[in-house]
Interface confidence: low
């Protein structure tokens, strides 16, 4: 996911002027003008602001990476929500990439949880019922599981 800073680059494209700031702040979906006299609307599908602010520019909408699907498109008040494609998940330790879910469990283990966009499959030992956490032998060609985080706006 491409993540923008709070200081997006200047853009020359005209934006529609809307209203005067309230106590120097502009409402969601707007940013403040250089002279702090006007609230300027963000451009739908291009940039956004989520709450009352004094940003000189709206925040640029996230573009979902290949390997991700767009769950919610960007509006003037909400960033794009991206989610890993089916069969892949986003790991907490490396949220910038979608990793392939394991296709099956190691020998002697059973699957108790399916692959979701925010977590790998979960395997437990047949007898003990304890979760599998250790490295899987290379021959299995699998990736160890780890707790994931739910899909969220990429801001």
């Amino acid at each position: 996911i491409t993540r923008q800073s709070l200081d997006p680059q200047r853009r020359a494209a005209p934006q529609q002027k809307r209203s005067s700031p309230t106590e120097g702040l502009c409402p969601p979906g707007h940013h403040i003008s250089e002279d702090s006299r006007e609230c300027i609307s963000c451009k739908y599908g291009q940039d956004y602001s989520t709450h009352w602010n004094d940003f000189l520019f709206c925040l640029r909408c996230t573009k979902c990476d290949s390997g991700e699907v767009e769950v919610n498109s960007c509006t003037t008040t909400r960033n794009t929500v991206c989610q890993c494609e089916e069969g892949t998940f986003r790991e907490e330790d490396s949220p910038e990439i979608c990793r392939k879910c394991r296709t099956g469990c190691p020998r002697g283990m059973v699957k108790v949880k399916d692959c979701t966009p925010w977590s790998d499959i979960e395997c437990v030992h047949k007898e003990s019922g304890t979760k599998h956490t250790g490295e899987v032998p290379a021959v299995e060609k699998t990736v160890t599981t780890s707790p994931g985080t739910p899909a969220s706006p990429c801001s």
Partner: antibody, heavy 121, light 118 residues
Framework: EVQLVESGGGLVKPGGSLRLSCAAS????????MHWVRQAPGKGLEWVAG????????YYADSVKGRFTISRDNAKNSLYLQMNSLRAEDTAVYYC??????????????WGQGTLVTVSS | QPVLHQPPAMSSALGTTIRLTCTLR?????????VYWYQQRPGHPPRFLLR?????????GPQVPPRFSGSKDVARNRGYLSISELQPEDEAMYYC???????????FGSGTQLTVLS
């Protein structure tokens, strides 16, 4: 769900130092202004300090200016208050509060449960 | 003299309407300020109730019922918090705050203790 959890309070001698922390979760911390507000036992609310979303602008009440420092670490979703040269009159519950905007307005929409600081010899 | 003055205590019966007052010192003009109100129940942190600038420019806090409403009297330099259909859980301390963007430091009123009589 927005959550603010303060820590670091305790008993300290006059002239001593203490560092309060506020762990924020449930919102995009790096785009909101933040405040510290205190309340002495049985007294009203006293605004202590505020910091804008980026940490570039910091403001203090006259009563703490030069002794307290507000700071934030947006990567850690944390707000801090470094308190030096503490006096008995700094004894209070210290609340961390979120501003509803990037700046510092009077609109403090979410508050933590507070942490007690006692300055006594 | 404090910038914001609130009466220390007020009381009213269950089910009635009460209006709490916050008076701004007269070297300031309430016309350019928003009035903010906070509620603090015993043993709890403060809770934001509402902001009032004008009838067309006001905002209610999260999960704050419409029984709580704000108003202003520019001639008297006062802000008001009205609470209708008073309930036992409305018994609390109420603080006002005022400000404009140009003034970043924050001042609270001294607070009014509201007692709900059964």
């Amino acid at each position: 769900e927005v959550q603010l959890v303060e820590s670091g309070g305790g008993l300290v001698k006059p002239g001593g130092s203490l560092r309060l922390s506020c762990a924020a979760s449930g919102f995009t911390f790096s785009t909101y202004g933040m405040h510290w507000v205190r309340q002495a036992p049985g007294k009203g609310l006293e605004w202590v300090a505020g910091i804008n979303y980026s940490g570039n602008n910091k403001y203090y009440a006259d009563s703490v200016k030069g002794r307290f420092t507000i700071s934030r670490d947006n990567a850690k979703n944390s707000l801090y208050l470094q308190m030096n040269s503490l006096r008995a009159e700094d004894t209070a519950v210290y609340y961390c509060a979120r501003d509803h905007s990037t700046w510092l307005s009077r609109h403090l929409d979410y508050w933590g449960q507070g942490t007690l600081v006692t300055v006594s010899s | 003299q404090p910038v914001l003055h609130q009466p220390p205590a007020m009381s009213s019966a269950l089910g009635t309407t009460i209006r709490l007052t916050c008076t701004l010192r007269n070297d300031h003009d309430i016309g350019v300020y928003s009035v903010y109100w906070y509620q603090q129940r015993p043993g709890h942190p403060p809770r934001f109730l509402l902001r009032y600038f004008s009838q067309s420019d006001k905002s209610q806090g999260p999960q704050v019922p419409p029984r709580f409403s704000g108003s202003k009297d520019v001639a008297r330099n006062r802000g008001y918090l009205s609470i209708s259909e008073l309930q036992p859980e409305d018994e609390a301390m109420y603080y006002c705050a005022m400000g404009a963007r140009s003034s970043v430091t924050h001042v609270f009123g001294s607070g009014t203790q509201l007692t709900v009589l059964s």
